[in-house]
Interface confidence: low
Amino acid sequence: DAHKSEVAHRFKDLGEENFKALVLIAFAQYLQQCPFEDHVKLVNEVTEFAKTCVADESAENCDKSLHTLFGDKLCTVATLRETYGEMADCCAKQEPERNECFLQHKDDNPNLPRLVRPEVDVMCTAFHDNEETFLKKYLYEIARRHPYFYAPELLFFAKRYKAAFTECCQAADKAACLLPKLDELRDEGKASSAKQRLKCASLQKFGERAFKAWAVARLSQRFPKAEFAEVSKLVTDLTKVHTECCHGDLLECADDRADLAKYICENQDSISSKLKECCEKPLLEKSHCIAEVENDEMPADLPSLAADFVESKDVCKNYAEAKDVFLGMFLYEYARRHPDYSVVLLLRLAKTYETTLEKCCAAADPHECYAKVFDEFKPLVEEPQNLIKQNCELFEQLGEYKFQNALLVRYTKKVPQVSTPTLVEVSRNLGKVGSKCCKHPEAKRMPCAEDYLSVVLNQLCVLHEKTPVSDRVTKCCTESLVNRRPCFSALEVDETYVPKEFNAETFTFHADICTLSEKERQIKKQTALVELVKHKPKATKEQLKAVMDDFAAFVEKCCKADDKETCFAEEGKKLVAASQAALGL
């Protein structure tokens, strides 16, 4: 449905508040270093222009595409060249190349200061003084640090952020009310950002077909009573939504996501019995709720898969006539029967099935050739099952912190070239799989664990892509989206790695460690552990444990000392010497 003015169309569909918020998110995700005030000014100019187009769709420039309008606006920023360097070259290009150029310059790890949370009273005063600016600042700060954050979902986070301040700033104990809510929003926000980053990587690096396959599997698990045609329609619409958001088309994305939620709720009888509560909520909550809805119950008496996909004489005929549709049906049928499998496992099975048909449908006796295809699935299913069992046992034995440390050592030995902050961040997140998933019964463990690990390993992949240092990481990240985790699991110690020179400065600590939160102190210790492994990759678990225990005791002792700084200086030298001796450095 063509509109004379795309900007007027979206302004009317979304309303002024959402329009302004989404344009701010879009601009902050593109120009991540620009000051808040500059972005607000640009957003206000775009909004005023949009209003003129709403009044008269034939007005000058109202017929231009959103990319043209937004790109032209971004290219008016005076300091573009000095702040962003070669990104300024994007402005010499025409659409659609200009937008593609901006997208390529999005930075997953921008050089921005850590967000420090002010005192509760300071935040409440700021909230009361100017609520609108306070909430815009939240959108801006999150968007620039997470340039692929799912924009309509960020509106939902902002709504919850506002609700937290509205409630808690008038509570008797503001801090007790507000801080847990902010912690929860922060943790959920990081998880949401990472999940969306995987969707965008899937689309951008592996293509629409890869994303659609993921969506077929996930939606079939979630809506096992829905017909294949219904799931296909949802997959097509969902793919459009995420393609738009990952491509920076945030207004279209938010609009289409709202349409999809509306469709799902109007057709919930043919989709899922679990949607009723979600569909009673307001728009932002509704969309979020649908995205997180639990799996519906599987229909009773589903027939065996073998009949249609192995025993039928028409397998090759059906495959040849419409390959992706036939494979989609296979994936749908398998996934709806297996909510206990991870999506990536289901995709591996579908890939194995596809490869088998490619080979067998060209053979002299196709049926004979593919008759045992389901037997090939057994080792693929058992591998993640065994891995999860072993790691959950290790997690239960060690607890989260020490489990993270075990993973830190494991991954540093696999890919020691990767930067220490990245290894610490990724291994800490890998370690969280224990508390997140090991508590679940067997039937829920694999989808929880392996699909979560896919999200975390994608963080490693996107951070590594920015500054590639390891061929092994590149290989695991680029060869196959669904085999990333097995690829990393299969990596052994990198025998080609030349140990890092010993640098005492790396292991010098000061009294400031004593005032850090428990989490930040853990990160300091884990950073030291990674550096130790980089110096001595052949160190045994026992050696590393002894050094880390000594280190923990050293920190505890010096933090209790009267003259902390002197203690850290003197005892630190002794610790370094003892560690060198223990590790044979």
Partner: nanobody, 123 residues
Framework: QVQLQESGGGLVQPGGSLRLSCAAS????????IAWFRQAPGKDLEEVSC????????NYADSVKGRFTISRDNAKNTVYLQMNSLKPEETAVYYC????????????????WGQGTQVTVSS
């Protein structure tokens, strides 16, 4: 309509080199594995080389290993086949073909084809 367009063919002496290009119009090659096939007069279609959509996987026919190199430049929406030490028996029409994401086992699995470019190796 999606189109692939080969270029870079021509007449070359034995032992010489050519670089073939396969460019796409109306769609982005980012999501497609691209293969090069060749067909000599009176012979069957033969797969020469293929590169996956990410560029992470490449394969070559045994007869061209070490002499031919396939590469891609997604920014230019183009895939290249660098052919060195060409032999007279490699005279053929060279075609590029596209399939979603990954290289396929046989020619009928490729969704889009170019018109072909003639390569003649002769002194």
């Amino acid at each position: 309509q999606v189109q692939l367009q080969e270029s870079g063919g021509g007449l070359v002496q034995p032992g010489g080199s050519l670089r073939l290009s396969c460019a796409a119009s109306r769609f982005t090659l980012d999501y497609y594995a691209i293969a090069w096939f060749r067909q000599a007069p009176g012979k069957d279609l033969e797969e020469v080389s293929c590169i996956s959509s990410s560029g992470g996987a490449t394969n070559y026919a045994d007869s061209v290993k070490g002499r031919f190199t396939i590469s891609r430049d997604n920014a230019k929406n183009t895939v290249y086949l660098q052919m060195n030490s060409l032999k007279p028996e490699e005279t053929a029409v060279y075609y590029c073909a596209a399939a979603t994401l990954e290289c396929r086992g046989r020619s009928s699995s490729y969704d889009y084809w170019g018109q072909g470019t003639q390569v003649t190796v002769s002194s």
